[in-house]
Interface confidence: medium
């Protein structure tokens, strides 16, 4: 059979025999448009498409709606893959979302959602999640039901305040909600009592800013 040369996600790349983690070129569904993504081919069986990573504060996440739409940063380091690509991809088939978190004391935890997708831009890339398991809290730190995405120039939250401007970063803010993995990156020893940091409330509480986060997706039937 003819060898596959374009891939929609890292799971397809993994199944094609390319099983080394790294940066790969993905193609938008039903399009020739391409995007660079980091593929984790080792964790939990591999085939994970990394859609977000924070690790050192090297990239500014207080970006515009358009930047969150198309993506920004460096796939080998801190980056946001892009809402439009993720929306298109997750509406093609069923995906799981795994969020891996690290604190400053050497602990790690994760939240796994058995079904994840983003609505279209017309619906403000609203997040849809079902079936939470994992070690980063029994309650979802992404408010349920899912909220619209908000940025500093696109306020779609449920607060009279502007959550994205107040807490920084684009996120699925409620009012403003128990998480924001795109907040300010505070270094160790400055990471407590910070309301606008990298927050996952049901693991570390409201004022704790995390050391590292990774959001990754994979087809549910992988």
């Amino acid at each position: 059979k003819e060898e596959q040369t374009t891939f929609r996600d890292c799971a397809e790349i993994f199944k094609s025999g390319l099983t080394t983690s790294g940066i790969y070129t993905l193609t938008f569904p039903n399009s020739t448009e391409e995007i660079k993504a980091y593929c984790d081919m080792e964790a939990g069986g591999g085939g994970w498409t990394i859609i977000q990573r924070r690790e050192d504060g090297s990239v500014d996440f207080q970006r515009t709606w358009k930047e969150y739409k198309v993506g920004f940063g460096n796939p080998s380091g801190e980056y946001w893959l892009g809402n439009e690509f993720v929306s298109q991809l997750t509406n093609q088939q069923r995906y799981v979302l795994k969020i891996h978190l690290k604190d400053w004391e050497g602990n790690e935890a994760y939240s796994l959602y058995e079904h994840f997708y983003l609505s279209s831009e017309e619906l403000n890339y609203r997040i849809h999640l079902k079936g939470l398991t994992g070690t980063a809290g029994k309650i979802s730190s992404i408010s349920q039901p899912g909220n619209d995405f908000s940025t500093k120039d696109g306020d779609n939250d449920k607060c009279i305040c502007k959550c994205s401007q107040m807490l920084t970063g684009g996120w699925w803010f409620d009012a403003c909600g128990p998480s924001n993995l795109n907040g300010m990156y505070y270094p160790q020893r400055q990471n407590t009592n910070k309301f606008n940091g990298i927050k996952w409330y049901y693991w570390k509480g409201s004022g704790y800013s995390l050391k590292a986060t990774t959001m990754m997706i994979r087809p549910a039937d992988f």
């Epitope: 504060g57 300010m184 270094p187 160790q188 020893r189 400055q190 407590t192």
Partner: antibody, heavy 121, light 106 residues
Framework: QVQLVQSGAEVTKPGASVKVSCKAS????????MYWVRQAPGQGLEWMGW????????NYAQKFQGRVTMTRDTSISTAYMELSRLRSDDSPVYYC??????????????WGQGTLVTVSS | EIVMTQSPATLSVSPGDRATLSCRAS??????FAWYQQKPGQAPRLLIY???TRATGIPARFSGSGSGTEFTLTISSLQSEDFAVYYC????????FGQGTKVEFK
């Protein structure tokens, strides 16, 4: 009383490395983080990174990632800062400074006397 | 990074005068803020931390105020030993310093 005594002035060539030491006395060395700050002639102060003398854990400023290494020897209460691949603009005075020890990870209450590094071919 | 802007760059005053130095942060740093004094050929010396708390051994003529983005260092009656360069520093989000204010003889 608390004292931080740094090694003497260094003259080195571009592309080489320099290692500056900072010997602490008058307090428990492992109880306070040690920071490194540099200052070009007539210029302001620039934070480079810190080391936790207790664990050896470090935190480097983005600008110096990959070029700076901070270590310590607890047996002689000494912290070290090594800067590699030196350029001509790496010629300021380098200071070690002790963290005040409060939770906010903040002000530097005691400083070394400074070490002048000259990078010249 | 948070940018710290000091003003004025140079302040010409006479001994016994009151000196007021300002520092502005590009975003809020709460009260995680300090002032340092530096004399030629010497290391900086911590004067004020937490925006308004005097460090050990610092005379009462030095006082600090402000929070958020605007901070002030006041020297109520300048002594000859106070002529130096003064730096502000935030330690809220990483660590950055202002470019300094030189207090010189008028």
């Amino acid at each position: 009383q608390v004292q931080l005594v740094q090694s003497g002035a260094e003259v080195t060539k571009p592309g080489a490395s320099v290692k500056v030491s900072c010997k602490a006395s008058g307090y428990t060395f492992t109880a306070y983080h040690m920071y490194w700050v540099r200052q070009a002639p007539g210029q302001g102060l620039e934070w480079m990174g810190w080391i936790n003398p207790n664990s050896g854990g470090t935190n480097y400023a983005q600008k110096f990632q990959g070029r700076v290494t901070m270590t310590r020897d607890t047996s002689i209460s000494t912290a070290y800062m090594e800067l590699s691949r030196l350029r001509s603009d790496d010629s300021p005075v380098y200071y070690c400074a002790r963290d005040q020890g409060i939770a906010a990870a903040g002000p530097f209450d005691y400083w070394g006397q400074g070490t002048l590094v000259t990078v010249s071919s | 990074e948070i940018v710290m802007t000091q003003s004025p760059a140079t302040l010409s005053v006479s001994p016994g005068d009151r000196a007021t130095l300002s520092c502005r942060a590009s975003q809020s740093v709460s009260s995680n803020f300090a002032w340092y004094q530096q004399k030629p050929g010497q290391a900086p010396r911590l004067l004020i931390y937490g925006s308004s708390t005097r460090a050990t051994g610092i005379p009462a003529r030095f006082s600090g105020s402000g929070s958020g983005t605007e901070f002030t260092l006041t020297i109520s009656s300048l002594q000859s030993e106070d002529f130096a360069v003064y730096y502000c520093q935030q330690y809220h989000y990483w660590w950055t310093f202002g470019q300094g204010t030189k207090v010189e003889f008028k």
